[in-house]
């Protein structure tokens, strides 16, 4: 079926529209376009004869139409009057006619709107404001935005006049915002510049600061007044009802007891005509002056400088007191007090000496404290730490390294890759890394005050595949029943599974075995000699699986209670005595012998030829393990009988 499609359907004035013909029959004689919904010779736009390829304008032709061989009609430079229906009349070769109708609508391009207001300075809780979006345009939709958000739901907000007018009833200071209106039609949308609503309000009840009302004679009184107000309030001060000055701050130096009284702040808003007041009562006491601390060095360098803090003023027959971190002074060889306690010296300051420090002057009734003083100890930079600790990254991820070194003032950071300076930032970010980003990453931390620099170098490897892992241990020779051992599978890599085996078996369930750090660390608590086994770690990621070489744990143990062999205790005179001592121990223990408490030789075997009854007594074997620091011993009684006096005696070795 012959159809007409308008592209576009909604057309902006001045633009063009194409009436596109679908399913045009074959074997045509010609066709004509007409304005309207029917064929009317008076409203013919253009005709076209296929045989001659001749286009003939009709009465409705405006010079803006172009007809194409496929019968489609292009109308250029569209005007409002072009809106409506268009009919295509097709004459086939057999002179049978066919018709189809299409339509489009014309809309103007909207101008940029503006906002008019009936009240430029509304008063809070009193006035209403009506915003109107200009100009008024037919077939346009109006929208409103407050702080670039759509209108909130509120009973105080009302849209009228086809949404062209936005009314805010009983304005509040929170209505101070950016307002925009927007006009839309099917072919355009335009937004106005923002209008800021200036709501007059206040003054609220003023606040007087500081809040404290008790002062010492000789101090300065500095009171500040503030009241929320638009436009800003004008301030006046009254003391005991007498006007003093029209300022926001009231300053009276070196006050006396006579300055005690009621202090009133009055806030006035000239636009709203409102006044508000607040009263505070000030009491001045006659007391000694407040102490303060002076320092001979405001920026001491760690491990280099000493600092002397002195409590001022110097007053005869006065007791001076000191506090550090709100505690009395700790006992330390680095803290020294002068004879009168007025000067506190810190020798060779450290970063932990920042304080705060306070001194006090004791009088009859109380202790007056100074303001706290904090020392600005310059230190560092320490060796920088690069995080995260991964050394392997897979291609395609983002590399984000952060460097931190303890330092005061804060360190300035630089990054180098393979020795080439990259940037002077604390963080280094490289997106979508490849194998080419493998290399030595150096973070340099510099302290501008001390002039010191420290660097840390990290090797980064970018590879889909992980390397053969290795096991690091925090304790290569742990002591039985005492030490813990933490095995860590290296390297640390993202998106990696870590696995462990002991003697080729998966980990046994034991309360002494603990996996942590994403299974990368295996901790054995309270090791025993049975833990001396082969430990293997494995790593697995998306493309690779690999195992470490085994690490055998060397557990130090013993010495256990020794055993003396042979077990015989009775010998015949003339026999040889050959005693051997053995104790389970790692490493092998040192042996020594005592006979009747007298030290003998430092050997594992004790040999005495041709014993006699004089060799009767106690034979003690002593074992010591220098590695574990442990000792053990056993005592055996030996009886030697005269030859032939007792049957069943050992003949000895």
């Amino acid at each position: 079926k012959l159809t007409i499609e308008s592209t576009p359907f909604n057309v902006a004035e001045g633009k063009e529209v194409l009436l596109l013909v679908h399913n045009l029959p074959q074997h045509l004689f010609g066709y004509s376009w007409y304005k309207g919904e029917r064929v009317d010779g008076n409203r013919q736009i253009i005709g076209y004869v296929i045989g001659t390829q001749q286009a003939t304008p009709g009465p409705a032709y405006s010079g803006r139409e172009i007809i194409y061989p496929n019968a489609s009609l292009l109308i250029q430079n569209i005007i409002q009057n072009d809106t409506g229906f268009y009919t295509l009349h097709v004459i086939k070769s057999d002179l049978v006619n066919e018709e189809a109708t299409g339509q489009f609508r014309v809309y103007p391009e909207l101008p940029k709107p503006s906002i008019s207001s009936n009240n430029s300075k509304p008063v809070e809780d009193k006035d209403a404001v009506a915003f109107t979006c200009e100009p008024e345009t037919q077939d346009a939709t109006y929208l409103w935005w407050v702080n670039n958000q759509s209108l909130p739901v509120s009973p105080r907000l009302q849209l009228s006049n086809g949404n062209r007018t936005l009314t805010l009833f009983n304005v509040t200071r929170n209505d101070t915002a950016s307002y925009k209106c927007e006009t839309q039609n099917p072919v355009s949308a335009r937004r106005s510049d923002s209008v800021i609503l200036n709501v007059l309000y206040g003054p609220d009840a003023p606040t007087i600061s500081p809040l404290n009302t008790s002062y010492r004679s000789g101090e300065n009184l500095n009171l500040s007044c503030h009241a929320a107000s638009n436009p800003p309030a004008q301030y006046s001060w009254f003391v005991n009802g007498t006007f003093q000055q029209s300022t926001q701050e009231l300053f009276i130096p070196n006050i006396t007891v006579n300055n005690s009284g009621s202090y009133t702040c009055q806030a006035h808003n000239s636009d709203t005509g409102l006044n508000r007041t607040t009263v505070t009562t000030i009491t001045v006491y006659a007391e000694p002056p407040k102490p303060f601390i002076t320092s001979n060095n405001s920026n001491p360098v760690e491990d280099e400088d000493a600092v002397a803090l002195t409590c001022e003023p110097e007053i005869q027959n006065t007791t001076y007191l000191w506090w550090v971190n709100n505690q009395s002074l700790p006992v330390s060889p680095r803290l020294q007090l002068s004879n009168d306690n007025r000067t506190l010296t810190l020798l060779s300051v450290t970063r932990n000496d920042v304080g705060p420090y306070e001194c006090g002057i004791q009088n009859e009734l109380s202790v007056d404290h100074s303001d706290p003083v904090i020392l600005n100890v310059l230190y560092g930079p320490d060796d920088p730490t690069i995080s995260p600790s991964y050394t392997y990254y897979r291609p395609g991820v983002n590399l984000s390294l952060s460097c931190h070194a303890a330092s005061n003032p804060p360190a300035q950071y630089s990054w180098l890759i393979d020795g080439n300076i990259q940037q002077h930032t604390q963080e280094l970010f490289i997106s979508n890394i490849t194998e080419k980003n493998s290399g030595l990453y150096t973070c340099q931390a510099n302290n501008s005050a001390s002039g010191h620099s420290r660097t840390t170098v990290k090797t980064i490897t970018v590879s889909a595949e992980l390397p053969k892992p290795s096991i690091s241990s925090n304790n290569s020779k742990p002591v039985e029943d005492k030490d813990a051992v933490a095995f860590t599978c290296e390297p640390e890599a993202q998106n990696t599974t870590y696995l462990w085996w002991v003697n080729g078996q998966s980990l046994p369930v034991s309360p002494r075995l603990q996996l942590s750090n994403g299974n990368r660390t295996l901790t054995l608590f309270n090791v025993t000699r049975n833990d001396a086994r082969a430990y293997v770690c494995g790593i697995q990621n998306s493309v690779s699986a690999n195992r470490s070489d085994p690490v055998t744990l060397d557990v130090l143990y013993g010495p256990d209670t020794p055993i003396i062999s042979p077990p015989d205790s009775s010998y015949l005179s003339g026999a040889n005595l050959n005693l051997s001592c053995h104790s389970a121990s790692n490493p092998s223990p040192q042996y020594s012998w005592r006979i009747n408490g007298i030290p003998q030789q430092h050997t594992q075997v004790l040999f005495i030829a041709k014993i006699t009854p004089n060799n009767n007594g106690t034979y003690a074997c002593f074992v010591s393990n220098l590695a574990t620091g442990r000792n053990n011993s056993i005592v055996k009684s030996i009886t030697v009988s005269a030859s032939g006096t007792s049957p069943g005696l050992s003949a000895g070795a």
């Epitope: 595949e465 053969k468 599974t497 494995g538 699986a545 195992r547």
Partner: antibody, heavy 120, light 106 residues
């Protein structure tokens, strides 16, 4: 015993699609990355990509990006490879494969392969 | 992409011969892995991480190399060793295989 069994191969028209399955037994596919590799008749091995069945993360050879889609159903312990817009040169045996450290030694397990023939 | 070039593409050898297959990478890789494939069968991991024999692989096989040049060696060829051998790199995406080396009976 670890086993991977592929299915879903067969004759496909040019321009058509196929969905291959790789059913795993003897292990949980959530714990391993599943790779797909293909081999055209008489030709070498060609890596297509991998999927992490636990979270659906994937990595493709760029030449298959857009035409191949890997997925997994952990409840069925099965991984899938969908190939679209098939051409004659996609005729190959398709294998699924895992690389694992389930024992103290790296192991590589492969399916038996499923033949896909693209022809009109 | 990292290209892997195996040589030779095929070789004929007798039982007992020493056979060496090389694999050259266009860019340095961490490790090379080797697979054995027999006709109609899936490939089998044969040597992993350059020099480690996979489970069940006879000790007459060995692997070596670093950087861009890697080698698979069979010290004394046995009848069951006749197959096609592929090298594979997993250092860089996409993972790539060599074109294969077919070991045939002379």
């Amino acid at each position: 015993e670890v086993q991977l069994v592929e299915s879903g191969g067969g004759l496909v028209q040019p321009g058509g699609s196929l969905r291959l399955s790789c059913a795993a037994s003897g292990f949980n596919i959530k714990d391993n990355y599943m790779h797909w590799v293909r081999q055209a008749p008489g030709k070498g091995l060609e890596w297509i990509g991998w999927i992490d069945p636990e979270n659906g993360d994937t990595e493709y050879d760029p030449k298959f990006q857009g035409r191949a889609t890997m997925s997994a159903d952990t409840s069925k312990n099965t991984a899938y490879l969908q190939m679209n817009s098939l051409r004659a040169e996609d005729t190959a045996v398709y294998y699924c494969n895992i690389i694992t450290m389930a024992t103290p030694y790296p192991m590589d397990y492969w399916g038996q392969g499923t033949l896909v023939t693209v022809s009109s | 992409d990292i290209q892997l070039t195996q040589s030779p593409s095929s070789l004929s050898a007798s039982v007992g011969d020493r056979v060496t297959i090389t694999c050259s990478a266009s860019t340095s890789v961490i490790y090379m892995h080797w697979f054995q494939q027999k006709p109609g069968k899936a490939p089998k991991l044969w040597i992993y991480s350059t020099s480690n024999l996979a489970s069940g692989v006879p000790s007459r096989f060995s692997g070596s190399g670093s950087g861009t040049d890697y080698t698979l060696t069979i010290s004394s060829l046995q009848p069951e060793d006749f197959a096609t051998y592929y090298c594979q790199q997993r250092s860089s995406y996409p993972l790539t295989f060599g074109q294969g080396t077919k070991v045939e009976i002379k």
